[in-house]
């Protein structure tokens, strides 16, 4: 699994809605694959972490002044939707086919 | 200044192009304000860090399993351009009015 010593990458993160208290309004699924972005943004930043110019600059400054400036951070750069069956304000079960921004599609250094 | 104990925010980061070796092709400015996103993404995530649903979910999972899952990360969510005078491939001084993605406009939790 990707830790602080490995490069920025997408790793599995199964989220159980009961664990986060969302089972009170989400009926299904019981859990889903959210993914997590893990690992470091080390110099030189590879193309696959799609670094912004600012991330490149910050990485170079961190190399020069590691105690003053942090590295860029490995974060979701593109998110995917999931489908959820949830209770609306009136408690009526409703199917949301695209519940946006719930799962990581891509990770990158920002 | 914003440290790990403070909430995610934009802080000053003056970048000198000589420090990062870019003075070989950037003629002016000699330095600029890049800003840096610093601080933690603590529960509950405030509106001003414009959290995605995934960041909210990850924050809740981190609360439940702090050793298994990391917090969301404070990163630039919007970048601004700067103007630069640089040497093109032929060594000709050229003004790039909008050199995109060089300075942080907004920070958020992702």
């Amino acid at each position: 699994s990707a830790g602080a010593g490995s490069h920025c990458q997408k790793t599995s993160l199964r989220v159980n809605f009961e664990d986060i208290g969302w089972d009170s309004w989400i009926i299904a699924p019981k859990e889903y694959e959210a993914y997590e972005c893990k690992g470091g943004c080390f110099f030189p930043l590879a193309d696959d972490v799609t670094p912004t110019k600012h991330a490149i600059v910050q990485t170079l400054v961190h190399l020069k002044f590691p105690t003053k400036v942090g590295k860029a951070c490995c974060v979701p750069t593109k998110l995917s939707p999931i489908s959820v069956l949830y209770k609306d304000d009136m408690g009526v079960p409703t199917l949301k086919y695209h519940y946006e921004g719930m799962s990581v599609a891509e990770c990158g250094c920002r | 200044s914003a440290g790990a104990g403070s909430h995610c925010q934009k802080t000053s980061l003056r970048v000198n192009f000589e420090d990062i070796g870019w003075d070989s092709w950037i003629i002016a400015p000699k330095e600029y304000e890049a800003y840096e996103c610093k601080g933690g993404c603590f529960f509950p995530l405030a509106d001003d860090v414009t959290p995605t649903k995934h960041a909210i979910v990850q924050t809740l999972v981190h609360l439940k399993f702090p050793t298994k899952v990391g917090k969301a990360c404070c990163v630039p969510t919007k970048l601004s351009p700067i103007s630069v005078l640089y040497k093109d491939d032929m060594g000709v001084p050229t003004l790039k009015y909008h050199y995109e993605g060089m300075s942080v406009a907004e920070c958020g939790c992702r």
Epitope: A28, P29, E33, K78, S80, I82, S83, A105 | -
Partner: antibody, heavy 120, light 107 residues
């Protein structure tokens, strides 16, 4: 193994209704969404809608609202699609398909299709 | 609705050929694209999801690529059982929409 067995071909009169069935086996029927797709002769595929079999909640393509009604019977692990006020435009092959997962937007198993012919 | 266009409605190829089937969307669909195969007997199978992920039990001669509005399905070494009609499908927006299909025939 996962199987979706659809009802046989239908020849019906214009203005009538028809109910197509899709019997699921080899998996937990209530844990997966069931989707329905239309294919007219020599044409592409059209998404009709989706049902959560466990609760009966549906989403429809606007184009098929009032035309298609999706239901499910948990006891027999069967999904149904009723088509009403039939016209020649409804003559097509209709497929049921299992949605692979809540966080994956693809159909991993399909029925064999039910041919509907609307003719006077 | 997002329109999915498969410009080539039919394609002739020989066994062993490398075949590429294209699909374009009326707007950026961010790789939210699947490919399905429909055999002459009408049976439909999933081949590829999310642009390039091969579904289980699908032979590795099938591959998918693309981004933005332009996508393609490639069969690297055409086999007799690959004779079928291939459909692309987007899922970034409702309603889900499919291409009109590309019928692959033997030369």
């Amino acid at each position: 193994q996962v199987q979706l067995q659809q009802s046989g071909a239908e020849l019906v009169r214009p203005g009538t209704s028809v109910k197509v069935s899709c019997k699921a086996s080899g998996y937990a029927f209530t844990n997966y969404l069931m989707e329905w797709i239309k294919q007219r002769p020599g044409q592409g595929l059209e998404w009709i809608g989706v049902i959560h079999p466990g609760i009966g909640v549906t989403n429809y393509n606007e184009k098929f609202k009032g035309k298609a009604t999706l239901t499910a019977d948990i006891s027999s692990s069967t999904a149904y699609m009723q088509l009403s006020s039939l016209t020649s435009e409804d003559s097509a092959v209709y497929f049921c398909a299992r949605r692979a997962n809540w966080d994956l937007y693809y159909f991993d198993y399909w029925g064999q299709g039910t041919t509907l012919t609307v003719s006077s | 609705d997002i329109q999915m266009t498969q410009i080539t409605s039919s394609l002739s190829a020989s066994l062993g050929d490398r075949v590429t089937i294209s699909c374009s969307a009326s707007q950026d669909i961010s790789n939210y694209l699947n490919w399905y195969q429909q055999k002459p007997d009408g049976t439909v199978k999933l081949l590829i999801y999310y642009t390039s992920s091969l579904h289980s039990e699908v032979p590795s001669r099938f591959s998918g690529s693309g981004s933005g509005t332009d996508y393609s399905l490639t069969i690297s070494n055409l086999e007799p059982e690959d004779i079928a009609t291939y459909y692309c499908q987007q899922y970034i927006n409702l309603p889900l929409t499919f291409g009109a299909g590309t019928k692959l025939e033997l030369k």
